[in-house]
Every structure is written in C-alpha cells, then in structure tokens.
Amino acid sequence: KSSSEATNITPKHNMKAFLDELKAENIKKFLHNFTQIPHLAGTEQNFQLAKQIQSQWKEFGLDSVELTHYDVLLSYPNKTHPNYISIINEDGNEIFNTSLFEPPPAGYENVSDIVPPFSAFSPQGMPEGDLVYVNYARTEDFFKLERDMKINCSGKIVIARYGKVFRGNKVKNAQLAGATGVILYSDPADYFAPGVKSYPDGWNLPGGGVQRGNILNLNGAGDPLTPGYPANEYAYRRGMAEAVGLPSIPVHPIGYYDAQKLLEKMGGSASPDSSWRGSLKVPYNVGPGFTGNFSTQKVKMHIHSTSEVTRIYNVIGTLRGAVEPDRYVILGGHRDSWVFGGIDPQSGAAVVHEIVRSFGTLKKEGWRPRRTILFASWDAEEFGLLGSTEWAEENSRLLQERGVAYINADSSIEGNYTLRVDCTPLMYSLVYNLTKELESPDEGFEGKSLYESWTKKSPSPEFSGMPRISKLGSGNDFEVFFQRLGIASGRARYTKNWETNKFSSYPLYHSVYETYELVEKFYDPMFKYHLTVAQVRGGMVFELANSVVLPFDCRDYAVVLRKYADKIYNISMKHPQEMKTYSVSFDSLFSAVKNFTEIASKFSERLRDFDKSNPILLRMMNDQLMFLERAFIDPLGLPDRPFYRHVIYAPSSHNKYAGESFPGIYDALFDIESKVDPSQAWGEVKRQISVATFTVQAAAETLSEVA
C-alpha cells in the first residue's frame, strides 16, 4: 500500500492519480522526437534539444526550469584526418585499412554529423608493432598472459574484446602492461545473440557496427581539468599533463568484420582455454605478432582525435515542495547520445519527460508534493558523467544538507525480459512495496504484479520468494550523488534474461544502429516496458517526495552489512597464516555490524510508534533516515580515489560498472599474495578494517536516540 498521504493542499491526489496519468503513447512520441538526429555532447544539436526540453518542462507546469552550463574537456575525431588501423607490410605499405565509418541504417543515409566510431579522450598517435590478443583485457586476463603464459605486452599493440568490464579499465590495464596502443572490438560471442538477425532485420550487431565510448579512468572526478570544483567561468584548469584520468596510449574501436581481418592472421601462443575464444572463425591465438607467412606484417594505428574545452548544458527543473521545500528528491538522466540514442539515453529521457508531464498535470490541478522534486537532463554523461558531476560539485553544500534521494533515469530498457534494480539497501522495501502495486507487463503474467514476474524471472540468490536487487556500481549519473555525496540512490530498467543471453550490454549499444526503429520494431512495440519503467521510477520519486515518513528501512542496511562483512572475512581467510602472523582480526567490524543491527532495530520500533503529527519529531526522524546514507561517507575518500568516499560501496577497481562492498578492505586484500612487502600490505588491510569499523559504528550512532 502507498505510504503517501495527501498534503493538506489537495487531498484528492495520490500516487494512483500520478501513475494513471502516465501513457505509453506519450513515451513513444517523445522517444521519436528525441532520436531523429544525433545529440552529441557539446554540439549545437544537443544545445537545441536542451532548450526544447526546458520549454516543454515549463509548459508541463514545473515551477522553474533553468539551463546550467559548464566548460568541460570533451573529445572528438578530427573531421579531415580520420582515425583508422592498418596492416602494413615490410615496405610500410598499408595492405588493409579498417573502416572509417559505420554503414548508416536505411533512412539515415543523409543525416549529417554522425560521429564516426572513436574512443573518446584517446591521445593522438601512430603506434606500430605486433599485435597481442588479450581477451577482455581484465585484470585476470593480464595475470594469465604475464604470469602464466610469460607473454610481455611491452611495446605491443593489444587487441581486446569489449564486454565484461568497463572499457576504461581495459585501457588502464593495457597501459600498466606496457602496451603502446589498444584496439577494442565487439566479438559476436558477446554482441550477437544466437538465432536473432542483424540490424535492420533484428536487434543484433552487424559486422560493420562499432561501439563508441569514453576510455577515461576518472574515479568520480568529473571534468578532468577541474576535479572537485565546477567547471565554471572562473574555474582554475589543470594543464593536460595534470588532467585526471586521461589514457596515455592511443585507443580505437572496430567492428567484428575488421577484427576478423586482424585476428585471422594471429600467430604465437594458442589461447589458454575456451574462455578466451569468441565466435569468429579465427584461431584466437594470443601472439605476439602474425603467423608464418604474415610474420613480417605489422599493425599500425592512426589516431588524430583532439580534446577541447567545450560548453555543455544541463536542464534543471524544479517542482517546489509544499511542506518541506528544503528537502530534495532528484530524478535525473542524461540527454547526450553518441549518435541517435534510441536506447541510450533517449528511452530514459522520454520516460523522464512523461514523468514530468504527469507531475505537471497534478500540479496544474492544485497538487504539490510534500518535498521538492528536482528533474535533471544531464549533458556529457557519455564523456565521463560530466554534466551531473559538475552540477553536484557546484551545489554540493545544498545537496549534502538537503538531498533525500536520487533516482537515475538513463536507458529504460536493455532488454524486455524482466525488471532490473540497483539501489541502496534503504530503498529495498520501497521497491518491493511499489512493484507489488504495479501490474506486470510480461506475457504470461497478465493480472499479476510486477513483483511476481520479477521474482519469478530474477530471484534473489539469498532470499527465496524475493527478487534480486543489485549493488550500485558506477558508469552512470548517480555516481556523484551516491559515491561522493552519500545521497540514497537507485536505478531501475527492463533487462534481458541473463541466464540465456551471455552478451555484454545489448548488441547495438553506442552504435549508429541504436535508433527509434530498433526500439519500436524489436524491443518494445507497445511501449509497455517503457511505461512500467516510468511507473517504477516515477512511483519511487512520488513516494520519496510525498511520504510523510521517508520510505527508507535502515534494517535492510543491517542485513547487507552482515553479508558484506562475512564476504570480506571469507576472502581474508584464504590467507589464514598471514592473518595469524600479522594479527589481522575482523572482530571489531562484526561488533560494529552487530551494534548497527541492534540500533537499527530499535530505531525502526521508534519510527513505527512515534507521533507523526508532531512536525518537529517527524522532521527529526526523517533527518536521521536521510542522513544515514551520508554517515557512510569518509571525507578522506578511498585510497587513491578521493571522490569515491562511500565506505560500504564503491565501483570496483577492476570494473567501473560493478559495485564492490567494503571496497577499501577488498582492494587492500586483492592479489595480496603477490605484494613485495607483506607486512605493509597486511598493515593496510588492518587500517581499512578499522576505517570500515569506525564508519559502521558512527553510522549506527546516528540512528540512536538523539538525547
């Protein structure tokens, strides 16, 4: 049941009125409107779309809608000097060149300003050398190459397949291995689902399709030239040599037709096992270099992209709260796309647009939410979450005092199988309760709840009869709010069947083929999954903004803290001798978790029983709930990652997309057996245990009775 209570201004409006106003047909119309031309960050087209959204949000009835601009470092290919990779013979002649562009889809042949595939922020360069195939270029892949196979990547160009981990981590790993360049490609094993046709006849990646994307390792910094501060008119900017997170070697992405031509000639060592082989008809030899007849041929990269400070624009809409206007619930998603953005981001932006329209309709009828709702259309997400991060840096003091929750709204779909939710444990119960009230759009679940279909298709690995909710990682605009500022955050979208579809992301991700037609023909012809996602995202925002008592359950944090403590303890216990030698104990952490559990339980009882009509008491209890996420922030941040400050969760150091629990301890323990100075290494483990213990205990104490 909705925990919302109508404000005293308009008793007739509740969440049902808001949800009933959401229409699939409108989302479809908005998606079509947003996807007719490219909206690359920093371009005139994306500025015009920002102004259009500003104008429409005003029409929909928001109190105010402003554009906020920042001047950030972006990266573009050189229009007159295209990027490509060649195979050169012993005379230096180019005997094969990779494609300069993706063949445009039917109907889009005359669209201008389609940016060719490139790796954003790649430095310029023309490295030349032998190729080494490095599988997914994960940490463990380089361990296998260097430690087991004794293959040295120093001075080599590496070719890695996309998938499994964020591309920036692949590039970082290649750099550390001494590579002089990186070629990224989409292997059909990861981006071609069996039995489905290539676009335009299906949703699979054609051989000429290429995934664009940034290759930064920002670790939450935002604009590389202004870490920690907004990139405004008076900002001090670092020189390029001191910029945060830029790769130091040239990088370029290609499709599988081009990859075939490079990989079919590979010689050297055979691949170590089947997990290194994709679906191309090539040997998947590791190298280095080409086989027999072709051993004198080399690979050469030609990269001429430039990085330039460019203006970007966020759209920020405000719907003022009637009772607690100084408490902010934020719904944000990005607007910039690599090309047409059929899924990423416009399937999300269209949903936000319809949510704004529905809230605006209620407001025009006299209703207001209890708390202020902020709506955001972020720019330059694709270039490193820049728009959201700069805005949060500019408004950090307000956000850390007033931010109740952030709901992310990038792509609404990455499949059409079931719901996928990642969020803070504080929101688990909100999500469960909401999905029990919503109707499932899935075939075979007519008349059943979304909770039921979600639980059936994506069961929790720990709790029977409940659906899976995952940890927040990064790679999207919630990062600054959650990982840096400690604002409770969540995201929801429709996803694929992870059991049967092993490919990473969806096949046409960040390609020119991510069009309106892709969504309308293959993913969601009736836009029923989009509507469901709008109901989930919008419903969460409604509850967070309108519930008298914030819909957070601190007991769910207690449960996961115990689970994460067990997990990290078990990792450490793989080294029992060292733990004994260096007196490593997790007792303090388990004690803090126990304290947190007890205090959270008592807090929940008080929350249930207190006098809700006492505004001071109500505000006090709500503040304790709001500030609980904030209590997990360590102002000093994680080692070497100052903008990742959440002690319980951080993006994995090996994959930005994945969340890691107790990341400080986890990283201290990672590969500890290979550390040169074990005493120092185990000392760092102990230090991280103490930081985690202190933080959990301190957070628990924020839930204690105030006096």
Epitope: F96, P103, P188, K261, K281
Partner: antibody, heavy 120, light 111 residues
Framework: QVQLQQSGAELVEPGASVKLSCKAS????????INWLRQRPEQGLEWIGG????????NYNENFKGKATLTIDKSSTTAYIQLSRLTSEDSAVYFC?????????????WGQGTSVTVSS | DIELTQSPLSLPVILGDQASISCRSS???????????LHWFLQKPGQSPKLLIY???NRFSGVPDRFSGSGSGTDFTLKISRVEAEDLGVYFC????????FGGGTKLEIK
Amino acid sequence: QVQLQQSGAELVEPGASVKLSCKASGYTFTYFDINWLRQRPEQGLEWIGGISPGDGNTNYNENFKGKATLTIDKSSTTAYIQLSRLTSEDSAVYFCARDGNFPYYAMDSWGQGTSVTVSS
Amino acid sequence: DIELTQSPLSLPVILGDQASISCRSSQSLVHSNGNTYLHWFLQKPGQSPKLLIYTVSNRFSGVPDRFSGSGSGTDFTLKISRVEAEDLGVYFCSQSTHVPTFGGGTKLEIK
C-alpha cells in the same frame, strides 16, 4: 542486394590461358573473401582458391597451384581468375562465390558461372 | 583434405513426403571456437548453388522452414519435411572448418 556478375563463356585452345572476371556489388567489397570453384560436367564442386580483397591475400587448393592465379581490382570491385596451360580437363563451369562472414562462414552468394571449353 | 561422403547418391521421393540426406566427414568439423562449419546447398539444373543451411542447423534467409539441418562432429543430416516440386535438384554438403570441400552431391528427384 548482393550480386556477383561473371564474364561470358570462353572457348580456348589447349595450352592457352584465359582470364575470367567476377564483378561484385551491393556490399562492402573489402570485408568478404571471394572464392573460385570448378564444376566439371556431371561432377561435384571443387574449391580452387580464395582471395581477400582487403589485403590481397590468397589461398589455393594444392591441386590448382600453378594452374590458377587469383587477383582483385579494388577500385572496380572485381575479382579475377587466370587459368593457364589449359587442357581438356579444365573444361568446366567456373563459379565465383562470396565467402560469408560471421555468422555464416559459408559461400552465401554465387555468380551465375562462366563456362570454359578447351578445344582445338 | 577433409572428405565429405554423401548418401544416397540419388533420392527418389513422392511430393509431400519427407526426404533425408546424410553427410559424413572424414574428420571432426568442430572449429577451435566450438562452432561447426558444415553447410548445405541446393543446385538446380543450369543454375549456381544456393545456400540453404549454414553451421549445421541455421536456415539462410529466405529458406522455407521445411528445411532443417542437424548433426555434430562427423555426422550430419539435411531433412526436408514435405518435399515440393521446387525442391528438386542436387544437394551438396560443404565444410569450411578446414580448407573448403564439398560432398559428391545427392540428386533429389520425383519417384
């Protein structure tokens, strides 16, 4: 749509050479190898060899080394086969066929065939 | 080279009946990537061969669903569930896991 258009029938004398062409259209020429095959009357298909338009790399069936030479002209998207020192045994229909890339890896598009008759 | 042996050489059928053609390879056709590159073609009189089935069991675009392929390792089968007049001709199996080779062909004709 993908098309492979082969040159017309040839009548050649024993010991002579002949050059057949295969003009490709409707796809990106450099991505797909071109195979050449021989079919003698009432017999099966024999693979002669293949050429990669991307880099000009060739592969030959051992039985046809010295008999067939494969070349390409990227500018006109045309593949050629030169057959030398012809004998009556070489009388056959010669096909060019595009080597399908992933997911097919089969000869997914064929020319109409060129009939070569070796006779004095 | 890999030898592909087809049987029968000739297959007389009644229209509407099922037809089954076998193709046996002299060695395994499983590629190191795990896929099996065994394909089926139909050649009608005076025409070039047309691809029907690729990688054992996948129908090429435009091929009716009465055609199906199966098998693994060295033994493969093409089935036509209800033979129609337009299906008559010579069927070849072919492999591209190694240097390409073709079976000798099976002539499907009316009984």
